[in-house]
């Protein structure tokens, strides 16, 4: 058993049929010695008396808010949550496996630049009685500070018969050094509590591996005289790290016909313009990627050819 | 060329070669997780590699003030990785193919380090750790870790030379 926060405790249980469970001793936070009784949740049934209460925690019915009283007055509370371990593996019932980039990916994180700011998100089908708490650091043995905000519900989607809820959090490294080569990864830890179930999820990454630039901005077409060719131009996204002579991007320009099955013409360039042939009913799209490190491409910025 | 006395390197040549190094480093180990070996573990086998750190002067301001500190750090790293790529980790079984990107990467690391430091000038270099794995799969894990680390190193080096070529070239 360990303390998650003041008066909230997590009991770690090996979860299998007829498991013996864990013996837990609760102590009433009071100077009083006599006349103390204990109850669980809203029940008025007295579970025991005395300054300490010993219970055998085996299942969710044994978890909940234990309260010690004296003469009708509440003295203190202890909330017990359960953390299940099945076949040596901690349960992951609360969050959905996003399966990208690999199986058992519960947390996904992205950064728009090298400033040390990043966003993580996760998915669940649970709509109520759900709380999250997020902590982060750079490295684990001698951790350096990363400050995370509160997790918020950022999207709701309907997936078949189910509703899916996306939560996200923004974090900022306290003393970021955008130009340095990272040697210690960022660690993100999410505590999830659903009713009386506790779970924790972790992710470890370098900012360089989660970079995904915003799409190029101000995408424009300029027809070239007496030609089917157009000059496409664009600019670096505002959110990208500066100076651009140091933090450079590379770009992919694509001409795509109306039909998805038409052959796409693609050009790769380090410049912020390119000359392409604009076919009727086609569209021109441009996306960006870090020039020197193969992290994710941005989403496409698009304009119609006409 | 960067010399200990402090003259400028051939920024544009260094830029071109460092950008080529980036491409080769990704051709040498293209995907995280593609070769998903189970015992990858987190034993810190590549902790001893030289990293370009915050105080090394490789940021735009540091380069403007005095590029020598940064260039020396980059040179140190290039020599370190060049030695690693020439060691048993890469020459042992499974042996490299003659025209492989790893082979070209090895040669290019040497090329860029020579651009930075002509014959007769000597900056300190770091000792490479004596890692001599006996099993091919252990060698593969080390290769992947070294190449992943090299990708990060050459990306910073390429940014330095791109910025130098754009703003510090005579």
């Amino acid at each position: 058993i360990w303390e998650l926060k003041k008066d909230v405790y997590v009991v770690e249980l090996d979860w299998y049929p007829d498991a013996p469970g864990e013996m837990v001793v609760l102590t009433c936070d009071t100077p009083e010695e006599d006349g103390i009784t204990w109850t669980l949740d809203q029940s008025s049934e007295v579970l025991g008396s005395g300054k300490t209460l010993t219970i055998q925690v085996k299942e969710f019915g044994d978890a909940g808010q234990y309260t010690c009283h004296k003469g009708g007055e509440v003295l203190s509370h202890s909330l017990l949550l359960l953390h299940k371990k099945e076949d040596g593996i901690w349960s992951t019932d609360i969050l959905k496996d996003q399966k990208e980039p690999k199986n058992k990916t519960f947390l996904r994180c992205e950064a728009k630049n090298y400033s040390g700011r990043f966003t993580c998100w996760w998915l669940t089908t649970i709509s109520t009685d759900l709380t999250f708490s997020v902590k982060s650091s750079r490295g684990s043995s001698d951790p350096q500070g990363v400050t995370c905000g509160a997790a918020t519900l950022s999207a709701e989607r309907v997936r078949g018969d189910n509703k899916e809820y996306e939560y996200s959090v923004e974090c900022q490294e306290d003393s970021a050094c955008p130009a340095a080569e990272e040697s210690l990864p960022i660690e993100v830890m999410v505590d999830a509590v659903h009713k009386l179930k506790y779970e924790n999820y972790t992710s470890s990454f370098f900012i360089r591996d989660i970079i995904k630039p915003d799409p190029p901005k101000n995408l424009q077409l300029k027809p070239l005289k007496n030609s089917r060719q157009v000059e496409v131009s664009w600019e670096y996204p505002d959110t990208w790290s500066t100076p651009h002579s140091y933090f450079s991007l590379t770009f992919c320009v694509q001409v795509q016909g109306k039909s998805k099955r038409e052959k796409k013409d693609r050009v790769f360039t380090d410049k912020t313009s390119a000359t392409v042939i604009c076919r009727k009913n086609a569209s021109i799209s441009v996306r960006a990627q870090d020039r020197y490190y193969s992290s994710s491409w941005s989403e496409w910025a698009s304009v119609p050819c006409s | 060329r960067a010399v200990p006395g402090g003259s400028s390197p051939a920024w544009t040549q260094c830029q071109q070669l460092s950008q080529k190094l980036c491409t080769l480093a990704w051709s040498a180990h293209p995907l995280v997780g593609h070769m998903d070996l189970r015992e990858e573990g987190d034993e810190e086998t590549t902790n001893d590699v030289p990293h370009i750190q915050c105080g090394d002067g490789c940021d735009p301001q540091g380069l403007r003030d005095n590029s020598q500190f940064c260039l020396q750090r980059i040179h140190q790293g290039l020599i370190f990785y060049e030695k690693l790529l020439g060691s048993d980790i890469f020459t042992g079984e499974p042996s490299l193919l003659p025209d492989s990107p790893v082979g070209q990467l090895h040669a290019s690391l040497l090329g860029l380090s020579q651009l930075l430091q002509p014959e007769g000038h000597h900056w300190e270099t770091q000792q490479i750790p004596s890692l001599s794995p006996s099993q091919p799969w252990q060698r593969l894990l080390l290769r992947f870790k070294i190449l992943r680390s090299l990708q990060a190193f050459v990306a910073v080096a390429a940014r330095v030379f791109a910025h130098g070529a754009a703003t510090l070239s005579p």
């Epitope: - | 995907l31 070769m35 193919l97 091919p136």
Partner: antibody, heavy 120, light 107 residues
């Protein structure tokens, strides 16, 4: 996710040619090669040859040398294997597999296979 | 070319049994020997690479050993889902070659 998706089944007459495609996704095509492996009905696996998408180099197995051509189209991240002068013993499932371009390695990702039947 | 000879060609075994398949190379190939499992109407799947290296997602009951010319694939405590053909493959030199295969049947 890395995927290799092959073209559909083919029925050919002896003496004809067949061209099987293998469309790749989830990785940078030019950073790998493609090997082709075939399996006659009820038989074992036979390596046919390889092509490096990095530099276009090819290497063919002796049994199909002279009748096979392996190519790549980097613009669509697709590899092709063309087998000419087909014979009945070319009836097989043809697989494309990812090939390391740095050192000889195991075949860790396979296409779903393309059945080619040669029959008069 | 390097010839790989597997034995046995066929084996009928009961669940929970320990199974051993051997692969012998006609010349030394170091540790450049890999093992695949192929179920009916499926593509082969990599089980072990470089003689003894486990692959992520492959159950730990599969293990490999050997070097030079003699190699072994061991399945500890066989399960019904392990009914399949098993092939060894050498990548030491071109042309790549495969063993003739071992068919495993569950009694």
């Amino acid at each position: 996710q890395v995927q290799l998706v092959q073209s559909g089944a083919e029925v050919k007459k002896p003496g004809a040619s067949v061209k099987v495609s293998c469309k790749t996704s989830g990785y940078t095509f030019t950073y790998y090669g493609i090997s082709w492996v075939r399996q006659a009905p009820g038989q074992g696996l036979e390596w046919m040859g390889l092509i490096s998408a990095y530099n276009g180099n090819t290497n063919y197995g002796q049994k199909v040398q002279g009748r096979v051509t392996m190519t790549t189209d980097t613009s669509t991240s697709t590899a092709y294997m063309e087998l000419r002068s087909l014979r009945s013993d070319d009836t097989a499932v043809y697989y494309c597999v990812t090939e390391n371009i740095n050192w000889r390695d195991a075949f860790d990702i396979w296409g779903q296979g393309t059945m080619v039947t040669v029959s008069s | 070319e390097i010839v790989l000879t597997q034995s046995p060609d066929f084996q009928s075994v009961t669940p929970k049994e320990k199974v051993t398949i051997t692969c012998r190379a006609s010349q030394t190939i170091g540790s450049s020997l890999h093992w695949y499992q192929q179920k009916p109407d499926q593509s082969p799947k990599l089980l072990i690479k470089y003689a003894s290296q486990s692959i992520s997602g492959v159950p730990s009951r599969f293990s490999g050993s050997g070097s030079g010319t003699d190699f072994t694939l061991t399945i500890n405590s066989l399960e019904a889902e392990d009914a399949a053909a098993y092939y060894c493959h050498q990548s030491s030199s071109l042309p790549y070659t495969f063993g003739q295969g071992t068919k495993l049947e569950i009694k």
